[in-house]
C-alpha cells in the first residue's frame, strides 16, 4: 500500500475528524470486520465537533488489520507521546490507514501547530493544495496553490508542509501565505 | 452446533482453475470474519485468505496472491475460493475456518500434470 | 518459509507433563496477545485447544494450558494421555503476514 503524504492542511481539510491523542493499551482485532482497534486517550480535537455530536470522547481508532491493504501500524510503545490523528469517521468511529495523516506533535513545526489549531480550517471551502509531482506543472484555478515540496525536495517535510498554508487573499484567488503571520 | 463443509477439490492441470466453496451452518455466518487455510501433504498449517463478516476487507497471503480470489455470499451461509494459474505447490488440503475457532474437514487440491 | 518455530518432536510418559514452545519476534508472539495452539491427529482437522495465549475453550480439557514470555509462547499438557499423541501447531497474528503459523510438533507418548 503505497500513498503520497499529502500536505498538513489537506489532511486536515479531507478528514471529518482531527484529534490529538495518545495511544495506550494493546491493539485488538475484531474478529467479525478484521479491522485493528489501537485504544487512544484524546487531548484535544481540532476538527469535528459537529460531526460527533455528543459522542465527543474518541476512546479508539480502527485500522485495517492488515498492512497491505492500508493498515496503519502505531510503531511506538511511548504511552504518553501525544499524536495528531487526522481520519475518517464511519458510523461513528474513526478510522485510519497509512495514508492518513498520523503523527507525533512534537515533530510537527509550530507553524504545522498553528495550522491545525486554528488557521487550516480558513482555506478549507475555498482553497486546494495541488501537488506538483513532475514539471511542467501549472495552476488549474486561481483557488489553487502549487504545492512543490516533493519535487524540490523530495521530502513532505518541505518549507510548504512545514511553514505555510493556502489560503484566500481574496474572492477566487489563494495564495501562499506564512502560519508565522497568523499569530493572533 | 458449528459445522463448516468444504467442496469443490479435485485434480487439475497446472494453470488451471478450481472454485472451493464451504457451506456454514449453527452461528450467524455474517458475524464472522472466515479465512481458508490448506495444509501441503506431510506439512504444517498456512493461512491463505480472509474476509470479514461484510465481505469488505479481504486479505491475501503472498504466495497467491494475484490468483486466489475469497468471497462469500451471507445470504446462502457459504464461503468461497477461487483458484486461478494453479501450480504444483498449490497442492494441499484446504480448509475452511471460522475466524480459527472452528475448522471444516477439509477438501484436496491436487495441481498435476 | 515457517514464522514461528516450534520444536519438531516431542514426548513424554502418561501421567508426566510436557512443554511444546513457539518462537517468533516482536512482530508477531511478542506484540499482541494472539497466539493460539491447535491439535491435529493423522487425516483430521485441526481443533482448537488455547486461544489468546492462555484461553481454552469449552469442552478442551484443563489439562491444556498456554503462556507467553516475550517472544516465546508454550503450550503444557500435563497429565499425558495416550490420546494427546498428535501434531501440535502454534498459530499467532501479525501485521504484515495477518496469521503466520508454526512449523508443528509431532508429540509422542511412549508406550
Known amino acids: 500500500c503505497t500513498c503520497v503524504p499529502p500536505h498538513p492542511q489537506t489532511a486536515f481539510c479531507n478528514s471529518d475528524l482531527v484529534i490529538r491523542a495518545k495511544f495506550v493499551g494493546t491493539p485488538e482485532v475484531n474478529q467479525t470486520t478484521l479491522y485493528q482497534r489501537y485504544e487512544i486517550k484524546m487531548t484535544k480535537m481540532y476538527k469535528g465537533f459537529q460531526a460527533l455530536g455528543d459522542a465527543a470522547d474518541i476512546r479508539f481508532v480502527y485500522t485495517p488489520a492488515m498492512e497491505s491493504v492500508c493498515g496503519y501500524f502505531h510503531r511506538s510503545h511511548n504511552r504518553s507521546e501525544e499524536f495528531l490523528i487526522a481520519g475518517k469517521l464511519q458510523d461513528g468511529l474513526l478510522h485510519i490507514t497509512t495514508c492518513s495523516f498520523v503523527a507525533p506533535w512534537n515533530s510537527l513545526s509550530l507553524a504545522q501547530r498553528r495550522g491545525f489549531t486554528k488557521t487550516y480550517t480558513v482555506g478549507c471551502e475555498e482553497c486546494t493544495v495541488f501537488p506538483c509531482l513532475s514539471i511542467p506543472c501549472k495552476l488549474q484555478s486561481g483557488t489553487h496553490c502549487l504545492w512543490t515540496d516533493q519535487l524540490l525536495q523530495g521530502s513532505e517535510k518541505g518549507f510548504q508542509s512545514r511553514h505555510l498554508a493556502c489560503l484566500p487573499r481574496e474572492p477566487g484567488l489563494c495564495t501562499w501565505q506564512s502560519l508565522r503571520s497568523q499569530i493572533a | 452446533q458449528v459445522q463448516l463443509v468444504e467442496s469443490g477439490g479435485g485434480l487439475v492441470q497446472p494453470g488451471g482453475s478450481l472454485r472451493l466453496s464451504c457451506a456454514a451452518s449453527?452461528?450467524?455466518?455474517?458475524?464472522?470474519?472466515m479465512s481458508w487455510v490448506r495444509q501441503a501433504p506431510g506439512k504444517g498449517l498456512e493461512w491463505v485468505s480472509g474476509i470479514s463478516g461484510n465481505g469488505v476487507l479481504i486479505f491475501y497471503a503472498d504466495s497467491v496472491k494475484g490468483r486466489f480470489t475469497i468471497s462469500r455470499d451471507n445470504s446462502k451461509n457459504t464461503l468461497y475460493l477461487q483458484m486461478n494459474s494453479l501450480r504444483a505447490e498449490d497442492t494441499a488440503v484446504y480448509y475452511c475456518?471460522?475466524?480459527?475457532?472452528?475448522w471444516g474437514q477439509g477438501t484436496l487440491v491436487t495441481v498435476s500434470s | 518459509d515457517i514464522a514461528l518455530t516450534q520444536p519438531a518432536s516431542v514426548s513424554g510418559s502418561p501421567g508426566q507433563s510436557i512443554t511444546i514452545s513457539c518462537t517468533g519476534t516482536s512482530s508477531d508472539v511478542g506484540g499482541y496477545n494472539y497466539v493460539s495452539w491447535y491439535q491435529q491427529h493423522p487425516g483430521k482437522a485441526p481443533k482448537l485447544m488455547i486461544y489468546d495465549v492462555s484461553n481454552r475453550p469449552s469442552g478442551v480439557s484443563n489439562r491444556f494450558s498456554g503462556s507467553k514470555s516475550g517472544n516465546t509462547a508454550s503450550l503444557t499438557i500435563s497429565g499425558l494421555q495416550a490420546e494427546d499423541e498428535a501434531d501440535y501447531y502454534c498459530?499467532?497474528?501479525?501485521?504484515?503476514?495477518?496469521?503466520?503459523f508454526g512449523g508443528g510438533t509431532k508429540l509422542t507418548v511412549l508406550g
Open positions: 449453527g452461528f450467524t455466518f455474517s458475524s464472522y470474519a
Open positions: 498459530q499467532s497474528y501479525d501485521f504484515v503476514r495477518f496469521m503466520v
Open positions: 475456518a471460522r475466524w480459527f475457532d472452528h
